[in-house]
C-alpha cells in the first residue's frame, strides 16, 4: 500500500499546534485511503528545507527568498503548490517588484548613481534585496560592506532599519531610519510616501503601493516605472516594466519523489473544506495563535505549480539574478558595456559539432550550450544558462510566452538589401506522392502523417490547427492511423513511423531521423502519405541537391502539393497552393541580452553568412548539407526587425490566434509552465 | 605569419592505427582552438574533430571513442590519434586554426 502521509514541517510551537489541528480535521473529511498529514517540527525554515531534503518531512510553505535557499544543492527542492490571493477568477501567485518615479524627472535605470532612493526597509525583498541585488555590479567598490557602498551610490536614501550611526546616508531622508510605522516613510506605503513628499528620487516598491496609495488614475497618471531595458512605462504596465516577478508563498518538495501530486491531492481537498469561507471549526487560512501559520492568512487559496517549473523558472531570472549577486557578490571583470561571449543554445550532437566549430571561428564571440529538446533550450535561455538560439515560429511563441524576444529574422530571398527587410514569410505545405492520386485534403483520416516536429509551423501548429477546426477535439493521433512527429508521446500512434533507434525515437532533434523539413520529407518518401513541411523542402532534397543515399535520385515532379480547396497542384505552384504562410524562422533571446546579440549575430554573419563563396574551405553559418543545424540552410541573412521586435508582433495577429485556438492541444510542458507565471 | 604542417598519414589496414599532427610555426596557434577537418575523393570536406583553447573538445559522431584528439601548447603542436581505422575513414586529413590557411593535408588510405 503506498504511503499517502504527507509529513508536514511546522517552525514554531503555535505552527506545530496548527498542524495537529490540520492533521485531525483532516481525518475526519478524508476517506482512509485519502491523503493524511503528519507533523514534524523544526527550530527554522532552513532547518526544515534540510529535512525534507533528507526525506525526514514532506512539504513546507516558503517566501521566495528561501525558494531559492531550498532550490540550492544539496537541497535541490522544487515548487509544486502556490499560494494564491485575490479572487479565483483573477487569482494572484505573484507579486512585481517595481522602481517608481515622478514622470518629469528624466532619467532612466541606468542613470540611478547620484539620485536619491526610498526603500520599503533593509533587507527587504521588494524594497531592498532585488532592487540592490540587480544594481549591485553597478555600486563602488568595495561593495563590502553592502550598506556602505549603497550609500555611496545614491546621494542619499531612506532605508528603514538600517544602523543610521554607521550609515547616516541610508537615514538622510527619514531621520533616525526607524523600523516601523512610526517612521512615516516605513513599509510599502512609506516608501511610496518618500517619492511623493520629494524626498526621493525612485521608491523601489511593489505593484499594488502606487494604486493602494492613489485611487485616482489622474494622480497615478504622474509616475512612471523604470524598466530593466532603460525605458520608462506608464504604472498600469508592470506587467511589461519591473525589477522582478516574485512568488509570494510557496510549497516545496523534493525534485525526486517529492510526492508532489499527493502533496497537491491532499492540499487541494484542504482547501475544499477548510479554505475562505468554507468552515468555522478549522480555517486553512487564519492563525488564532499567532500570524501567517503554516499557510499565509491573506491567501485566498492554492494552484498546482506545473511540473515543468523548477525553482529558477518559477523564481524568474530577473529575481535569481539579484538574490544571487547579493549572496554571492561575484560581478564580472569586464567593463559592462562590452558585451560577453553568447551562448548559442544547440540541439543534439549534430547541432552541437557546428556550433563548436562556430565558436573556434568566432575567435571567443560564440560559446555553446547543449540541450535535448527546443523546449530546454527556451528554459536555458530564460534562466541564463544560454543566451540565444534560432526558431521556428511556433517555438517562438511559446519563447514570448516565456519572456524572451525576437531580434533577428531568417531571410531566404537573395535581395540587395537583405539584412534591412524582413520578409514577409514562407509558404505552409502538405506534399504528397504523384502516385496517389486520390488522395486529397479532404480524405487525409486514416493515412499516415509525417510532421516536422509537434509545435513547429508548417509541420504541426498550421496543418493541425486547420484540422481541428474541422474536426473539434485534440486527437490528431486517432485522425491518422500512424505518423511521425517528433515530440508527441513515444506511445502515441504518432511516433509509429519514426526511425530513431532506441530512446532517439520520435525525440524532437536531429537525432531522430524524421525530424525537421527534410526528416518529414524523407518520412514521406520512405513511408508516410503526406508530410508537412515548407515550400522550398521538396526543390532542395530533389534533384541530386541531396547527397544522402535516400535522396539522391529523387525527382521533384513526382510530388504535388494538397490544397485547402481540395485540388492538388505542381509543387512549383506553392504560392496558389499552400496551407497558409508562416512567420520565417528567428532568432530569440532574453530582453537584457538583445542588443549584444544582435551585434555580435550581425558581425559574425558578415564573416560566416552568404557572403561567404567556398563553403569547403570556409566555415558558413547557414550550411549543414541540408540538415538545417543552428539555421535553416536556406538562410541568406539575418534581418533586422525594426519595431516588430515582440513575439505578438513578429508572428502577426493571425498567426498568434491560430496557435492560441490550437493552445487547448497543446502538450507543451513549457508553455504551460510560462503561462503559469504570466496567465 | 603562422603556417600549419600536417603529417602521420599513410596506408593502413582496417582495425588498424594511425597518429597524425599538426605542427605550427609562428606564434599564437591554436589560441582559439584547432579543428581537423577531412575530405574523401569527391565529397565534401567535413569536420572530424576539434580542440578548443580551455581543453574543450568534440567529435564527429562516425569517429567518437575511436579517435582522440590531444594538445600540446609548448610544441606548438595538435595531436589525432586515430584507432580501430575503418575505410570510410579515407581521406586527405587537414588541421586548421581561424585565420590561418589549410595546409597540404596528409592522406589516410584504409584499406579492408
Known amino acids: 500500500v503506498p504511503d499517502k502521509t504527507v509529513r508536514w514541517c511546522a517552525v514554531s510551537e503555535h505552527e506545530a499546534t496548527k498542524c495537529q489541528s490540520f492533521r485531525d480535521h483532516m481525518k475526519s473529511v478524508i476517506p482512509s485511503d485519502g491523503p493524511s498529514v503528519a507533523c514534524v517540527k523544526k527550530a527554522s525554515y532552513l532547518d526544515c528545507i534540510r529535512a525534507i531534503a533528507a526525506n525526514e518531512a514532506d512539504a513546507v510553505t516558503l517566501d521566495a527568498g528561501l525558494v531559492y535557499d531550498a532550490y540550492l544543492a544539496p537541497n535541490n527542492l522544487k515548487p509544486v503548490v502556490a499560494e494564491f490571493y485575490g479572487s479565483k477568477e483573477d487569482p494572484q501567485t505573484f507579486y512585481y517588484a517595481v522602481a517608481v518615479v515622478k514622470k518629469d524627472s528624466g532619467f532612466q535605470m541606468n542613470q540611478l548613481r547620484g539620485k536619491k532612493s526610498c526603500h520599503t526597509g533593509l533587507g527587504r525583498s521588494a524594497g531592498w534585496n532585488i532592487p540592490i541585488g540587480l544594481l549591485y555590479c553597478d555600486l563602488p567598490e568595495p561593495r563590502k560592506p553592502l550598506e556602505k557602498a549603497v550609500a555611496n551610490f545614491f546621494s542619499g536614501s531612506c532605508a528603514p532599519c538600517a544602523d543610521g550611526t554607521d550609515f547616516p546616508q541610508l537615514c538622510q531622508l527619514c531621520p533616525g531610519c526607524g523600523c516601523s510605522t512610526l517612521n512615516q516613510y516605513f513599509g510599502y506605503s512609506g516608501a511610496f510616501k518618500c517619492l511623493k513628499d520629494g524626498a526621493g528620487d525612485v521608491a523601489f516598491v511593489k505593484h499594488s503601493t502606487i494604486f493602494e496609495n492613489l485611487a485616482n488614475k489622474a494622480d497615478r497618471d504622474q509616475y512612471e516605472l523604470l524598466c530593466l531595458d532603460n525605458t520608462r512605462k506608464p504604472v498600469d504596465e508592470y506587467k511589461d516594466c519591473h525589477l522582478a516577478q516574485v512568488p509570494s508563498h510557496t510549497v516545496v518538495a523534493r525534485s525526486m519523489g517529492g510526492k508532489e501530486d499527493l502533496i497537491w491531492e491532499l492540499l487541494n481537498q484542504a482547501q475544499e473544506h477548510f479554505g475562505k469561507d468554507k468552515s468555522k471549526e478549522f480555517q486553512l487560512f487564519s492563525s488564532p495563535h499567532g500570524k501567517d501559520l503554516l499557510f499565509k492568512d491573506s491567501a485566498h487559496g492554492f494552484l498546482k505549480v506545473p511540473p515543468r517549473m523548477d525553482a529558477k523558472m518559477y523564481l524568474g531570472y530577473e529575481y535569481v539574478t539579484a538574490i544571487r549577486n547579493l549572496r554571492e557578490g561575484t560581478c564580472p571583470e569586464a567593463p559592462t558595456d562590452e558585451c560577453k561571449p553568447v551562448k548559442w543554445c544547440a540541439l543534439s550532437h549534430h547541432e552541437r559539432l557546428k556550433c563548436d566549430e562556430w565558436s573556434v571561428n568566432s575567435v571567443g564571440k560564440i560559446e555553446c550550450v547543449s540541450a535535448e529538446t527546443t523546449e530546454d533550450c527556451i528554459a536555458k535561455i530564460m534562466n541564463g544558462e544560454a543566451d540565444a538560439m534560432s526558431l521556428d515560429g511556433g517555438f517562438v511563441y511559446i519563447a514570448g510566452k516565456c519572456g524572451l524576444v525576437p531580434v533577428l529574422a531568417e531571410n531566404y530571398n537573395k535581395s540587395d538589401n537583405c539584412e534591412d527587410t524582413p520578409e514577409a514569410g514562407y509558404f505552409a505545405i502538405a506534399v504528397v506522392k504523384k502516385s496517389a492520386s486520390d488522395l486529397t485534403w479532404d480524405n487525409l483520416k486514416g493515412k499516415k502523417s509525417c510532421h516536422t516536429a509537434v509545435g513547429r509551423t508548417a509541420g504541426w501548429n498550421i496543418p493541425m490547427g486547420l484540422l481541428y477546426n474541422k474536426i473539434n477535439h485534440c486527437r490528431f493521433d486517432e485522425f491518422f492511423s500512424e505518423g511521425c512527429a517528433p515530440g508527441s508521446k513515444k506511445d502515441s500512434s504518432l511516433c509509429k513511423l519514426c526511425m530513431g533507434s532506441g530512446l532517439n525515437l520520435c525525440e524532437p532533434n536531429n537525432k531522430e531521423g524524421y525530424y525537421g523539413y527534410t526528416g518529414a520529407f524523407r518520412c514521406l518518401v520512405e513511408k508516410g502519405d503526406v508530410a508537412f513541411v515548407k515550400h522550398q523542402t521538396v526543390p532542395q532534397n530533389t534533384g541530386g541537391k541531396n547527397p544522402d543515399p535516400w535522396a539522391k535520385n529523387l525527382n521533384e515532379k513526382d510530388y504535388e502539393l494538397l490544397c485547402l480547396d481540395g485540388t492538388r497542384k505542381p509543387v512549383e505552384e506553392y504560392a496558389n497552393c499552400h496551407l497558409a504562410r508562416a512567420p520565417n524562422h528567428a532568432v530569440v533571446t532574453r530582453k537584457d541580452k538583445e542588443a549584444c546579440v544582435h551585434k555580435i549575430l550581425r558581425q559574425q554573419q558578415h564573416l560566416f553568412g552568404s557572403n561567404v563563396t567556398d563553403c569547403s574551405g570556409n566555415f558558413c553559418l547557414f550550411r549543414s548539407e541540408t540538415k538545417d543545424l543552428l539555421f535553416r540552410d536556406d538562410t541568406v541573412c539575418l534581418a533586422k526587425l525594426h519595431d516588430r521586435n515582440t513575439y505578438e508582433k513578429y508572428l502577426g495577429e493571425e498567426y498568434v490566434k491560430a496557435v492560441g485556438n490550437l493552445r487547448k492541444c497543446s502538450t507543451s510542458s513549457l508553455l504551460e509552465a510560462c503561462t503559469f507565471r504570466r496567465p | 605569419q603562422v603556417k600549419l604542417e600536417e603529417s602521420g598519414g599513410g596506408l593502413v589496414q582496417a582495425g588498424g592505427s594511425l597518429r597524425l599532427s599538426c605542427v605550427a610555426s609562428?606564434?599564437?596557434?591554436?589560441?582559439?582552438?584547432v579543428i581537423w577537418y577531412r575530405q574523401a575523393p569527391g565529397k565534401q570536406r567535413e569536420l572530424v574533430a576539434l580542440?578548443?583553447?580551455?581543453?574543450?573538445?568534440n567529435y564527429r559522431e562516425s569517429v567518437k571513442g575511436r579517435f582522440t584528439i590531444s594538445r600540446d601548447d609548448a610544441k606548438n603542436t595538435v595531436w589525432l590519434q586515430m584507432n580501430a581505422l575503418e575505410p570510410e575513414d579515407t581521406g586527405v586529413y587537414y588541421c586548421?586554426?581561424?585565420?590561418?590557411?589549410f595546409g597540404q593535408g596528409t592522406q589516410v588510405t584504409v584499406s579492408s
Open positions: 586548421k586554426t581561424p585565420g590561418v590557411p
Open positions: 609562428g606564434s599564437g596557434f591554436g589560441i582559439n582552438g
Open positions: 580542440i578548443k583553447s580551455d581543453g574543450y573538445t
